[in-house]
Interface confidence: medium
Amino acid sequence: SLAADTPTACCFSYTSRQIPQNFIADYFETSSQCSKPGVIFLTKRSRQVCADPSEEWVQKYVSDLELSA
C-alpha cells in the first residue's frame, strides 16, 4: 500500500497570526493520521509553525514556495 516518507508531526492548533513571508524556508503537509489537516512552515531559524491550510495567506505562501522549486 502507499506509504509516504513524510514527517509525522501533527497540528493541534494553528498560528493566530500571519508569519512574515521572508521568515519562511519550506513547508510540508501533516500526516493523514493527524486529527486535523495542517501545513507546517519551517522558518529560516528552523522553527516549525502550524498553519491552517484553508487560510488565504497559507495557500499563497505555499504557492510561492512551489513556484521557487
Epitope: 500500500s1 503537509e29 493523514s32 489537516p37 522549486a69
Partner: nanobody, 123 residues
C-alpha cells in the same frame, strides 16, 4: 500493487470542456500528492497541476491556471482534472501520478504513474 488508471480523454473542439479522472487501487492516497502531467507529440512531459491530499492545497502550471481545476473524491479514491476553455495547444497524453514530492512540480519524485489518456483539441 498500486495502480492508477486515467479515463475521460477524447476529441473535443477548442473552447469545450473535458473532465479526466484518475482512479487509484491497491493503496490509499493518504499522505500523497496527486499530480497531473501531460506530454504532447515531440515534447517533454510537463507539469499541469497537483493536489496535496490532506490539506487539499493545489498548484497549477501558468499555462492552465484559471482554466483547469483539480479535485478529489475520498470515497472513490479518485482525483479529477476539470479542463475548461480547451485550446489546441492542450492536445497531449495526460498522465496522473502519485508521490511525496517536496515540491509538487518535481516529476521525478512521483512514485506511481498511470498509463495516460489522450486529449485532442481541434480548432
Amino acid at each position: 500493487e498500486v495502480q492508477l488508471v486515467e479515463s475521460g480523454g477524447g476529441l473535443v473542439q477548442a473552447g469545450d470542456s473535458l473532465r479526466l479522472a484518475c482512479a487509484a487501487s491497491g493503496g490509499t492516497f493518504s499522505n500523497y500528492a496527486m499530480g497531473w502531467f501531460r506530454q504532447a507529440p515531440g515534447k517533454e512531459r510537463e507539469f499541469v497541476g497537483a493536489l496535496r491530499w490532506i490539506t487539499r492545497i493545489t498548484y497549477y502550471a501558468d499555462s492552465v491556471k484559471g482554466r483547469f481545476t483539480i479535485s478529489k473524491d475520498n470515497a472513490k479514491n479518485t482525483v479529477y482534472l476539470q479542463m475548461n476553455s480547451l485550446k489546441p495547444e492542450d492536445t497531449a497524453v495526460y498522465y496522473c501520478a502519485a508521490g511525496s514530492p517536496s515540491r509538487l512540480v518535481n516529476m521525478n519524485q512521483y512514485n506511481y504513474w498511470g498509463q495516460g489518456t489522450q486529449v485532442t483539441v481541434s480548432s
